[in-house]
């Protein structure tokens, strides 16, 4: 039995693979900020994590997913203040009683250091120094992703 | 200057109603979740209510759940408990205190400012 | 009867280091919950003085120290002044609300 959030990124992901390819994204839409390989958006408003999840959908994009503690790092260096907490991808998955990304993937134990209990209906959050289980339904801010894939220049055969 | 000064303790008989108000000041107070915590005399703090700074959200100590509602007016920056069927155990300070973390209650939070106290009194 | 414990009250001479303990369990301290702590000196409001287990706000000074590990936490005081007596809570979060421990009273000898 999956839990509302459950269903809701599983949906969200299977429509999104439904869509046809985009061009890959060269540079980073107006207010994104890049990272690497990729742009963020920081909210300004403030949703619960399930409503953050489709915020970001619509957006074409996902809910930030952190692929080790350096990538966790370089993320809150651009969180300005530490009193502000921001959703990422991150939630309890009560079925395999284990965090899951929702890319589908589990959290490797050694890549963050969680601060709260993992239980039913608690999703995961940042700060400027931390990363914290809280309740799903807590208002707060998000981090939406966009991944850039720079396209490779054709080579055409001489005609 | 962060300030919190509340008001509207007193005397009141068992069973009465009483509301609180505290005024706040030097900052953003629609930003921040606010809460009430409470002191009996010559007891410990204990956490009694909690509201998200747009108000849409409350939490509230099993203690006063049905009993006391938590509000607040961002136009007048003021945070309110109404406090109703109230008891001699519900004598104690009332302290208004600001939530570290912005928005909403945090399960994390701390409160950073706390007002004076105003003292609520239930006795016949 | 609160979810978290402190000693009633500790003791030291001006200079020493003294420290005070937060005892909880698996709901609370245990489930990673960050642990916060408060001076309230006589006739006052609490002050926040610890928070999120070591941090600590601008203005306390650091003879102010606080740590966590496992189920329990605590608040180290050293180089004990006079101005330092007063009542000491420790605050974490359990089955869904803020609580605190029962206080601990600090005098300095």
């Known amino acids: 039995q999956k839990s509302s959030i459950e269903k809701c990124s599983v949906d969200i992901q299977q429509s999104r693979n439904k869509t046809t390819e985009r061009p890959g994204l060269l540079n980073c839409p107006i207010y994104w900020q890049q990272l690497r390989e990729k742009c963020l958006l920081f909210s300004h408003t403030v949703n619960p994590w399930n409503n953050s999840l489709a915020d970001c959908s619509t957006k074409e994009s996902s809910l930030l997913l952190i692929r080790d503690k350096d990538e966790l790092i370089h993320t809150q260096n651009l969180i300005r203040d530490k009193a502000i907490l921001f959703w990422i991808g991150l939630n309890f998955s009560l079925s395999e009683k284990n965090w899951k990304w929702i890319n589908g993937s589990f959290l490797n134990s050694n890549d963050l250091e969680i601060r709260g209990d993992a239980k039913e209906n608690s999703c995961i959050s940042i700060s400027q120094t931390s990363v914290y289980s809280e309740y799903c339904s807590t208002e707060i801010r998000w981090i939406c992703q966009k991944e850039l894939t720079p396209v490779r220049n054709k080579v055409y055969p001489d005609s | 200057e962060v300030q919190l000064v509340e008001s509207g303790g007193g005397l009141v008989q068992p069973g009465g109603s009483l509301r609180l108000s505290c005024a706040a000041s030097?900052?953003?107070?629609?930003?921040?979740?606010m809460s009430w915590v409470r002191q009996a005399p010559g007891k410990g703090l204990e956490w009694v209510s909690a509201i998200s700074g747009s108000g849409g959200s409350t939490y509230y100590a099993d203690s006063v759940k049905g009993r006391f509602t938590i509000s607040r007016d961002n136009s007048k920056n003021t945070l309110y408990l109404q406090m109703n069927s109230l008891r001699a155990e519900d004598t104690a300070v009332y302290y208004c205190a600001r939530d570290y973390y912005l928005y909403d209650y945090i399960t994390q939070t701390s409160f950073d400012y706390w007002g004076q106290g105003t003292l609520v009194t239930v006795s016949s | 009867q609160s979810v978290l414990t402190q000693p009633p009250s500790v003791s030291g001479a001006p200079g020493q280091r003294v420290t005070i303990s937060c005892t909880g369990g698996?709901?609370?301290?245990?489930?990673?919950?960050?642990v916060h702590w408060y001076q309230q000196l006589p006739g006052t409001a609490p002050k926040l003085l610890i928070y999120g287990n070591s941090d600590r706000p601008s203005g306390v000074p650091d003879r102010f120290s606080g740590s966590k590990s496992g189920t329990s936490a605590s608040l180290a005081i050293t180089g004990l002044q006079a101005e330092d007596e007063a009542d000491y809570y420790c605050?974490?979060?359990?089955?869904?609300?803020?609580?605190f421990g029962g206080g601990t009273q600090l005098t300095v000898l």
């Open positions: 698996s709901s609370n301290i245990g489930a990673g919950y960050d």
């Open positions: 030097g900052f953003t107070f629609s930003s921040y979740a």
């Open positions: 605050q974490s979060y359990d089955s869904g609300h803020t609580v």
